[in-house]
């Protein structure tokens, strides 16, 4: 019993004054707690607790289930205990069959004895099976049998507590050991989509999948740079032993522009942590942004091909696309496709294939695209480069020689005089007048140039060459004339096209 020193509170005293008491089943348990500041008796066995506010605890007919620790507590919080065994040959064990063991830790098989004097208190495998060779245990009649350093391989091991009573082995009810694995790697986390683009008012929902060996992995959705607790819903499954999956779904039922940001799914266990992020962008309305992949002013040679290519961002999805030229819509020759097959893709490509372009097919080609919120367009100005064509070459009544040529880019007209029968006209002649004429054709068509020289300057027989040229090629026309005395003969023009 505790010694009393004046001025210092002491623990209560219990009668009978033993640490352990053995009574037979059916006998009376009578425990007296003496203390001026008595508060209560507490009884504990396995996970059950009972309280009694009387200072004398009386159980008239003791049962095996009255086996346990009886503790008396005073107002100073000091206590004293006695352990009572209620010996019942028909019930040697009290059991709590819940048996969970943490890998690499010790775990208690809770089968305390009702009789401390039985022998060979130990563990046995079910149906006569041997226990794993490396399984070590320590018996304690008041608590049960402690399995040392639980291994993952012991999972679902079937066990009995066992004692020898009068030379016979007696087994408890069976226990199934469930091993909780130790974390030996960080959780595996993944997210349903890496980025989300929404319009205001739409629902944002994103799922994080957490995989680990056990359900005691911790996980949460966090908003970066914010402490606000997010509303999330969990689904989870054990796909098998040591194969646990949780799906944490974060939902914002009506997203606002200021909900935009980075959301992190964070998971950790005792080994370490892992996280994955997703980005939410909320826009007040949809949009389309078009990016030409080639210059919007295009020069192409006559008879060649050109592809007009645009990339565009469209959110929500594009609904109508078309290519237009001269108020006519192309029904073929173009294709439109997403830039990637990714579910969150908002980038698309549209290509118009123009083949063997003629000089008359220059002009403005327009790409139009729309979605449920907006329309957008982009125009390409296509110029077809053509070799000059000499439209007219005449001697005018006023004695002028006139050459009119068309082509793109704008042709330059040079004049040459070839005296006599020479084939090479080298002496250049300066024009009297050069004009660029307005073409009657469509814009972006050929440009027409008119150039004139004064034939009176020529005093000898010969040929005059009108040469029209640009970046694409050149074309010539010739005027032949001869002198009879002082009179010029009729001039005979002819053309010679040079490649």
């Amino acid at each position: 019993q505790p010694s009393v020193s004046p001025g210092e509170p002491s623990p209560p005293s219990i009668h009978p004054g033993k640490s352990d008491l053995i009574v037979r089943v059916g006998d009376e348990i009578r425990l007296l707690c003496t203390d001026p500041g008595f508060v209560k008796w507490t009884f504990e066995i396995l996970d059950e607790t009972n309280e009694n506010k009387q200072n004398e605890w009386i159980t008239e007919k003791a049962e095996a289930t009255n086996t346990g620790k009886y503790t008396c507590t005073n107002k100073h919080g000091l206590s004293n205990s006695i352990y009572v065994f209620v010996r019942d040959p028909a019930k040697l064990f009290l059991v709590d069959r819940s048996l969970y063991g943490k890998e690499d830790n010790d775990t208690l098989v809770r089968c305390p004895l009702t009789d401390p004097e039985v022998t060979n208190y130990s563990l046995k495998g079910c149906q006569g099976k041997p226990l794993p060779k490396d399984l070590r245990f320590i018996p304690d009649p008041k608590a049960g049998i402690m399995i040392k350093s639980v291994k993952r391989a012991y999972h679902r091991l079937c066990l009995h507590c066992s004692v020898d009573q009068e030379g016979k082995s007696v087994l408890s009810e069976k226990f199934i050991l469930k091993v909780r694995p130790a974390f030996k790697a960080v959780p595996v986390v993944s997210v349903s989509k890496a980025s989300y683009l929404l319009r205001e008012g739409e629902e944002f929902t994103v799922t994080c999948t957490i995989k680990d060996v056990s359900s005691s992995v911790y996980s949460t959705w966090k908003r970066e740079n914010s402490q606000t607790k997010l509303q999330e819903k969990y689904n989870s499954w054990h796909h098998g032993d040591f194969n646990y999956e949780r799906q944490a779904t974060l939902t914002i039922s009506s997203a606002r522009v200021n909900d935009s940001g980075v959301f992190m799914c964070y998971a950790n266990n005792t080994f370490g942590s892992a996280n994955v992020t997703t980005t939410l962008e909320v826009v007040d309305k949809g949009f389309i942004n078009i990016f030409p992949m080639i210059n919007t002013t295009v020069f192409v040679n006559d008879g060649e091909n050109v592809d007009l290519i645009v990339e565009y961002e469209a959110f929500p999805k594009p609904e109508h696309q078309q290519w237009i030229y001269m108020n006519r819509t192309f029904t073929d020759k173009w294709e439109d496709y997403p830039k990637s097959e990714n579910e969150s893709n908002i980038r698309y490509v549209s290509e118009l294939h123009l083949t063997r372009l003629k000089g008359t097919e220059g002009g403005t080609y327009t790409f139009l695209v729309s979605n449920s919120d907006v329309n957008a367009a982009i125009a390409f100005n296509v110029y077809v480069n053509t070799k000059p064509e000499i439209l007219t070459y005449d001697r005018l009544v006023n004695g002028m020689l006139q050459c009119v040529a068309a082509g793109f880019p704008e042709p330059t007209i040079d004049w040459y005089f070839c005296p006599g029968t020479e084939q090479r006209c080298s002496a250049s002649v300066l024009p009297v007048d050069v004009q660029t004429l307005n073409s009657s054709g469509p814009p972006f068509g050929k440009l027409v140039v008119q150039s004139s020289i004064d034939s009176s300057a020529f005093k000898h027989n010969g040929t005059v060459e009108c040469k029209a040229y640009n970046d694409v090629g050149k074309t010539s026309a010739y005027f032949n004339f001869a002198f009879k005395g002082n009179n010029k003969e009729q001039i005979h023009p002819h053309t010679l096209f040079t490649p």
């Epitope: 996970d47 059950e48 607790t49 359900s215 689904n235 499954w237 054990h238 098998g240």
Partner: antibody, heavy 123, light 107 residues
Framework: QVQLVQSGAEVKKLGASVKVSCKAS????????MHWVRQAPGQGLEWMGV????????NFAQKFQGRVTMTRDTSTSTVYMELSSLRSEDTAVYYC????????????????WGQGTLVTVSS | DIQMTQSPSSLSASVGDRVTITCRAS??????LGWYQQKPGKAPKLLIY???SLESGVPSRFSGSGSGTDFTLTISSLQPEDFATYYC?????????FGGGTKVEIK
């Protein structure tokens, strides 16, 4: 002995809220998850959600998300279930149940049940 | 969510009969299954946990078997006090779900 004692029957108006309590005794309160299950008249059992008394973590069935709140008071070993925006189909007996023989709310089973609380939603 | 399908929904039997109730999960749930008995006006009572472990105090005529997706509750010799409704429940993952129930009536 281990037991769960629930609060008495309630009659509530449409759109109102109800808060049912469940007082645990005879065991270590913080060691066991506590679930709520309801049963409409003549119907089967429907799991509503769970609270971990040791830390107060919760998980709810999707159906009740946003309408149900589960709390606990460790000083009185009591858990509470509050259901808001009551509808006529919420008329049911509500049970609290201890998750025994299990681990972190899985496996095992509900080994101890409260006696049930009848909640009637009237117009 | 994991769906639990119980069959039959009701059955009639006599005292002494052997009764079998089955429960099927929509996906594998290991042996994370419980069986409950409920009598009118009363709270459910746990009979079997972990698919086959008999709860303390439950008569040995009740037994459970199965793992993965198919489970069975067997009452080896039906007693008058066994006429009740029986429910299975999966405890493998959230949300936890119950079977629809099997009502055992007197023939």
């Amino acid at each position: 002995q281990v037991q769960l004692v629930q609060s008495g029957a309630e009659v509530k108006k449409l759109g109102a809220s109800v808060k049912v309590s469940c007082k645990a005794s005879g065991y270590t309160f913080s060691s066991y998850y506590m679930h709520w299950v309801r049963q409409a008249p003549g119907q089967g059992l429907e799991w509503m959600g769970v609270i971990n008394p040791n830390g107060a973590g919760t998980n709810f069935a999707q159906k009740f998300q946003g309408r149900v709140t589960m709390t606990r008071d460790t000083s009185t070993s009591t858990v509470y279930m509050e259901l808001s925006s009551l509808r006529s189909e919420d008329t049911a007996v509500y049970y609290c149940a201890r998750h025994g023989r299990g681990y972190e709310g899985y496996e095992g089973a509900f080994d101890i049940w409260g006696q049930g609380t009848l909640v009637t939603v009237s117009s | 969510d994991i769906q639990m399908t119980q069959s039959p929904s009701s059955l009639s039997a006599s005292v002494g009969d052997r009764v079998t109730i089955t429960c099927r999960a929509s996906q594998g749930i290991r042996n994370d299954l419980g069986w409950y008995q409920q009598k009118p006006g009363k709270a459910p009572k746990l009979l079997i946990y972990d698919a086959s472990s008999l709860e303390s105090g439950v008569p040995s005529r009740f037994s459970g078997s199965g793992s993965g997706t198919d489970f069975t509750l067997t009452i080896s010799s039906l007693q008058p006090e066994d006429f009740a409704t029986y429910y299975c429940q999966q405890l493998n993952g959230y949300p936890l779900t119950f079977g629809g129930g099997t009502k055992v009536e007197i023939k």
